[in-house]
């Protein structure tokens, strides 16, 4: 499996000047070398990938991952059973649906097996880390001479998602954006029949069921107008 590590948010401070600082009790040693951060994402509540930047280690190290849920029936420490690899070094762990409990505090521990004191424990709110699949089955229908309605589907509980619709014409340099709540439909009240329109949608697990910051991928675009809309003025859902 290839893993995708989302790039850090431009924090130049994250790995510099570590040895200029004092630790509270221990003298500086291998065990105080900082471990890479673990970043987890829950994909459509079907599986979760927790990944780390294995190349940040001073030498190639197969770090191990354990996890548990704080204060729950699932608080037994679990070993990662499905590691992800980057150049034959562990760089992540994949958890399956049955191991995901969105509304319990997820505790993840990364450890250097050669130096057991070298470990880092993080806590995560999984409901804020859900990334839904891109919206599918975009369709357009003409409500009136100048009004279009865009509909789409999500492979998830619809009430948990908010959406962002973007559209533009061939004449536009940039997209126009419109936020849409869980209703997953969007109306464009004023359509110019002489222009060709392109629409696309993405979705986010927010705000009713979680507070995720990351959007899904964009849907495939759908087009309306110019020559093609004359073929069927009432329904047109050809994807690019």
């Amino acid at each position: 499996l290839n893993t995708t590590i989302l790039t850090p948010n431009g924090n130049e401070d994250a790995t510099t000047d570590f040895f200029l600082t004092s630790m509270p009790t221990d003298s500086l040693s291998v065990s105080t070398l900082p471990l890479p951060e673990v970043q987890c994402f829950v994909f459509n509540v079907e599986y979760m990938n927790c990944t780390w930047n294995s190349s940040s280690e001073p030498q190639p190290t197969n770090l191990t991952l354990h996890y548990w849920y704080k204060n729950s029936d699932n608080d037994k420490v679990q070993k990662c059973s499905h590691y992800l690899f980057s150049e034959e070094i562990t760089s992540g762990c994949q958890l399956q649906k049955k191991e995901i409990h969105l509304y319990q505090t997820f505790v993840v521990q990364l450890q250097d097996p050669r130096e057991p004191r070298r470990q880092a424990t993080q806590m995560l709110k999984l409901q804020n880390l859900v990334i839904p699949w891109a919206p599918e089955n975009l369709t357009l229908r003409k409500l009136s001479e100048s009004q279009l309605e865009l509909n789409w589907n999500n492979r998830f509980l619809n009430h948990c998602l908010e959406h962002l619709v973007q559209y533009r014409t061939d004449w536009d340099h940039s997209w126009t954006e419109q936020s849409v709540d869980y209703r997953h439909k969007f109306s464009l009240p004023s359509v110019d029949g002489q222009k060709r329109y392109t629409f696309r949608v993405r979705s986010r697990f927010n705000p009713l069921c979680g507070s995720a910051q990351h959007w899904s991928e964009w849907s495939h675009p759908i087009h309306w107008g110019s020559n093609s809309s004359k073929e069927n003025p009432f329904l047109f859902a050809l994807e690019a």
Epitope: N9, N11, A14, A120, Q122, M123
Partner: nanobody
């Protein structure tokens, strides 16, 4: 280099409140995971409250519902509001910070923090 200075500790009766402050200089805390830890005599240092810069906060079981973590990025300070204090809360309280790349990173392990304050004593009498 970040310097962290705690204040607000003291002697308080059981059931009372204190508000600890941690002022940072040298760097902005806006992209730091922050934590409050405590160490009682003869015991290991333990986390009390931890926070990612994305705003996810977690509390130790023993303080949940009584203590509240907050941060003021404009003032470059973090706080720990401690209510319904109990004698078992007596300890030296430390503020700690770690620059992180991800908004969701909140560390409960003390060795993950790069910067530490000198500590402030909290004593709760019965």
């Amino acid at each position: 280099q970040v310097q962290l200075v705690e204040s607000g500790g003291g002697l308080v009766q059981a059931g009372g409140s204190l508000r600890l402050s941690c002022a940072a200089s040298g760097r902005t805390l806006s992209r730091y995971a922050m934590g409050w830890f405590r160490q009682a005599p003869g015991k290991e240092r333990e986390y009390v409250a931890i926070d990612s810069w994305g705003g996810d906060t977690f509390y130790a079981d023993s303080v949940e519902g009584r203590f509240t973590f907050s941060r003021d990025n404009a003032k470059n300070e973090v706080y720990l509001q401690m209510n319904s204090l109990q004698p078992e809360d007596t300890a030296v309280y430390y503020c700690a910070g770690a620059p992180t790349s991800f908004a969701t990173t909140a560390y409960s392990s003390s060795n993950s923090y790069r910067y530490w304050g000198q500590g402030t004593q909290v004593t709760v009498s019965s």
